[in-house]
């Protein structure tokens, strides 16, 4: 039967009807006290008072209400939930993922895990109702746990009419015995001891480093991974793991040449709740890829929205080269990763300057041919975008990757609604689209515009009637990805380039395909 | 530090395909790049791979009869030239690349003869 | 292709004394990333090539400091401070703007 809940759009818990809870008011000591009314959360500040015992993890302060039991945990940076018991800054799981307790919450699948605070999971042998479910990890969240001891991480998903188990794909920590690292690398233990300009690291309890904090001799040397060797390390919170240097007989440090372990493609998707002309608005953790490119111009004050863009490391977006062709100056040029609403600030976006561009040189500006271009963030070290949940790289895909036709991708952008729209889309929107066969993609299906072998077509197969909103891209999405899943990860095959019309029945999109271009990328990646 | 291991030396008849192995440790991240020498001569580019994604690229002198692969799981680069000739008997290096080709393997002899 | 032209083909040189080799390239090796992918190499008789200086003038790991690289453009330079009798071999320069990667036909460096 179907149920009133409310969600509560500051902490994503869910809530039944006429259900009440307290929560902290963010950056204020007042506490709210919520009930759920026909849908809608309806709050007002409370008098509160400390505990008069500990009930928060993580180093949370508890506050109880003055005139009734509920109690409520002010967590520190990086906790979360009713305990703060969820570590927010857990970008993977160790061993069987027995204590995860971070934000993860995606299936293999690609399917949004269910709350574990759900009503449909009160039979379930394992739901956020448990005694012990504070103890699990379980509770008024959709997080990826392991409360069973099963293999890894797993979640119950909504699948062909009902709640069934499935594994998340949440990374593992250590991947076998590839020797990489996670997050900024503080868990590293690998054994990689070069630097990145190829220099050999320093023994950490080299005789030359007395003086220094960081040594075989510091107190906390063991639990920071310090010892009697020269493995790249990260022990006070950098960027990235590093190591003591001599440089010309001068004692220095430097970052280290260890791989970050790839969590490329992996993101946690939320089905899109609102439909829109062209396809559906979206959150940005959905596609935390999808990069927005301002620029300023020489005759006109402030940034306009140019072009979206794709993540594909730290410090590298690619996009259309079409996009470029005004020739801006790289310090006019301004990419921010993790926004939702293309003009507001998002509470986690990240702004980067453009340190320079490089647009294919056959780039062909009546065809679109070789519409591919790069752009290196500025950064002061060799990191620019920090993971996060709404700022993660895509996979770049194989050279041999060939999906089937009619595969179903999607792609995203700030892009207009409709082709004759004089406006952009205010919101991130997401498009699914099918691939068309190379024998679909041709000049005769497109007005007799030049199809090249490096372009590809995709579009909306579904049939309809004149008001069909078919979905596609549009002007302002251009430079954005095409996505389709492959071997569990969002894979890049596509980059936005042209179209006729957006949203027309049996007229595809054309997309840069970016398997011609593997070694172009990496080439002009290089450092 | 990146170790490249190689396969052994080779006899081929004119005509026929060499496939030679580069088995590599360390960060297996980088392009692997293919170099020959003629005895007493100078080093010749042939092409590159990428490890990760497979991506290759090719000296036009070479497009046609050589073909770089990798398998993953074993960290193992592969070049198979065909169509072999007198003149391509060299002793074939791998090196890996990263801001340049940092590390050598030791070679393996290639000699073409009837 | 990018032809680069080393000279001189053969260099006897006395332990202790400079020594310089010169690498011309037949057009920019600038790369369209802004990098100059100019590096030297060193081939000891019997051995792999060693990789001595990349990009123009950084030193690699573990190369004595005795070794220098410079130039731009179009023309770059390999010295060596004080030559030591382990420096012996033949240098070549090597380009990876520009596919395909070339190398220049290499000088001798020997004792006199």
């Known amino acids: 039967s179907y149920q009133v809940i409310c969600r509560d759009e500051k902490t994503q818990m869910i809530y039944q009807q006429h259900q009440s809870w307290l929560r902290p008011v963010l950056r204020s000591n007042r506490v709210e006290y919520c009930w759920c009314n026909s849908g809608r959360a309806q709050c007002h500040s409370v008098p509160v008072k400390s505990c008069s015992e500990p009930r928060c993890f993580n180093g949370g302060t508890c506050q109880q209400a003055l005139y009734f039991s509920d109690f409520v945990c002010q967590c520190p940076e990086g906790f979360a939930g009713k305990c703060c018991e969820i570590d927010t800054r857990a970008t993977c799981y160790e061993d069987q993922g027995i204590s995860y307790r971070g934000t993860w919450s995606t299936a293999e699948s690609g399917a949004e895990c269910t709350n574990w605070n759900s009503s449909a999971l009160a039979q379930k042998p394992y739901s956020g109702r448990r005694p012990d479910a504070i103890r699990l990890g379980l509770g008024n969240h959709n997080y990826c746990r392991n409360p069973d001891r099963d293999s890894k991480p797993w979640c119950y998903v909504f699948k062909a009419g009902k709640y069934s188990s499935e594994f998340c794909s949440t990374p593992a920590c250590s991947e076998g015995n590839s020797d990489c690292y996670f997050g900024n690398g503080s868990a590293y233990r690998g054994t990689h001891s070069l630097t990145e300009s190829g220099a050999s690291c320093l023994p950490w309890n080299s005789m030359i480093l007395i003086g220094k904090v960081y040594t075989a001799q510091n107190p906390s040397a063991q639990a920071l991974g310090l010892g009697k060797h020269n493995y790249c390390r990260n022990p006070d919170g950098d960027a990235k793991p590093w190591c003591h240097v001599l440089k010309n007989r001068r004692l220095t440090w430097e970052y280290c040449d260890v791989p970050s372990c790839s969590t490329c493609g992996l993101r946690q998707y939320s089905q899109p709740q609102f439909r829109i002309k062209g396809g559906l608005f979206a959150d940005i953790a959905s596609h935390p890829w999808q990069a927005a490119i301002f620029a300023k111009h020489r005759r006109s004050p402030g940034e306009r929205f140019l072009c979206g863009g794709i993540l594909i490391s730290s410090c590298w977006i690619l996009s259309a080269a079409h996009c470029f062709q005004e020739r801006f100056p790289p310090h006019h040029l301004t990419v921010i990763l993790g926004r939702t609403y293309r003009v507001v600030p998002g509470e986690e976006e990240q702004k980067f300057e453009v340190e320079k561009y490089i647009v294919h040189k056959e780039f062909d500006d009546d065809t679109y041919d070789n519409d591919i271009a790069l752009l290196q963030l500025k950064s002061d070290s060799s990191r620019c975008a920090q993971e996060s949940s709404v700022v993660r790289t895509v996979c770049l895909p194989p050279a041999d990757l060939q999906l089937p036709d009619w595969t179903e991708c999607e792609l995203s952008g700030y892009g207009k609604h409709e082709a004759l729209s004089p406006f952009y889309s205010e919101r991130l929107k997401e498009a699914h689209v099918r691939l068309y066969p190379s024998s679909r993609c041709t000049s005769q299906h497109l007005l007799n515009r030049t199809v090249t072998d490096n372009m590809l077509c995709a579009g909306d197969t579904r049939s309809g009637g004149p008001q069909a909103n078919l979905h596609d891209a549009c002007q302002g999405d251009s430079g954005g990805p095409l996505v389709c899943l492959n071997d569990g990860r969002m894979t890049l095959v596509g980059i936005i380039s042209w179209g006729l019309g957006c949203g027309q029945k049996d007229v595809p999109g054309v997309y840069t395909k970016v398997t011609n271009y593997l070694d172009w990328i990496r080439d002009n990646m290089r450092p | 530090q990146v170790q490249l291991v190689q396969s052994g030396a080779e006899v081929k008849k004119p005509g026929a395909s060499v496939k030679v192995s580069c088995k590599a440790s360390g960060n297996t991240s980088y392009w692997i790049n293919w170099v020959r020498q003629a005895t007493g001569q100078g080093l010749e580019w042939m092409g590159r791979i990428d490890p990760g994604g497979g991506s290759t690229g090719y000296a036009q002198k070479f497009q046609g009869r050589v073909t770089m692969t990798r398998n993953t799981s074993i960290s193992t680069a592969y070049m198979e030239l065909s169509s072999l000739r007198s003149e391509d008997t060299a002793v074939y290096y791998c090196?890996?690349?990263?801001?340049?080709?940092?590390?050598w393997g030791q070679g393996t002899l290639v000699t073409v003869s009837s | 292709d990018v032809v680069m032209t080393q000279s001189p083909l053969s260099l006897p040189v006395t332990p202790g004394e400079p020594a310089s080799i010169s690498c011309r390239s037949s057009q920019s090796i600038v790369h369209s990333n802004g990098n100059t992918y100019l590096d030297w190499y060193l081939q000891k008789p019997g051995q792999s090539p060693q990789l001595l200086i990349y990009?123009?003038?950084n030193r690699a790991s573990g190369v004595p400091d005795r070794f220098s690289g410079s130039g731009s453009g179009t023309d770059f330079t390999l010295k060596i401070s004080r030559v030591e009798a382990e420096d012996v071999g033949v240098y070549y320069c090597?380009?990876?703007?520009?596919?395909?990667?070339?190398f220049g036909g290499g000088t001798k460096v020997e004792i006199k």
């Open positions: 990009k123009v003038s």
């Open positions: 090196a890996s690349y990263y801001y340049a080709m940092a590390y």
């Open positions: 090597f380009q990876g703007s520009h596919v395909p990667w070339t």
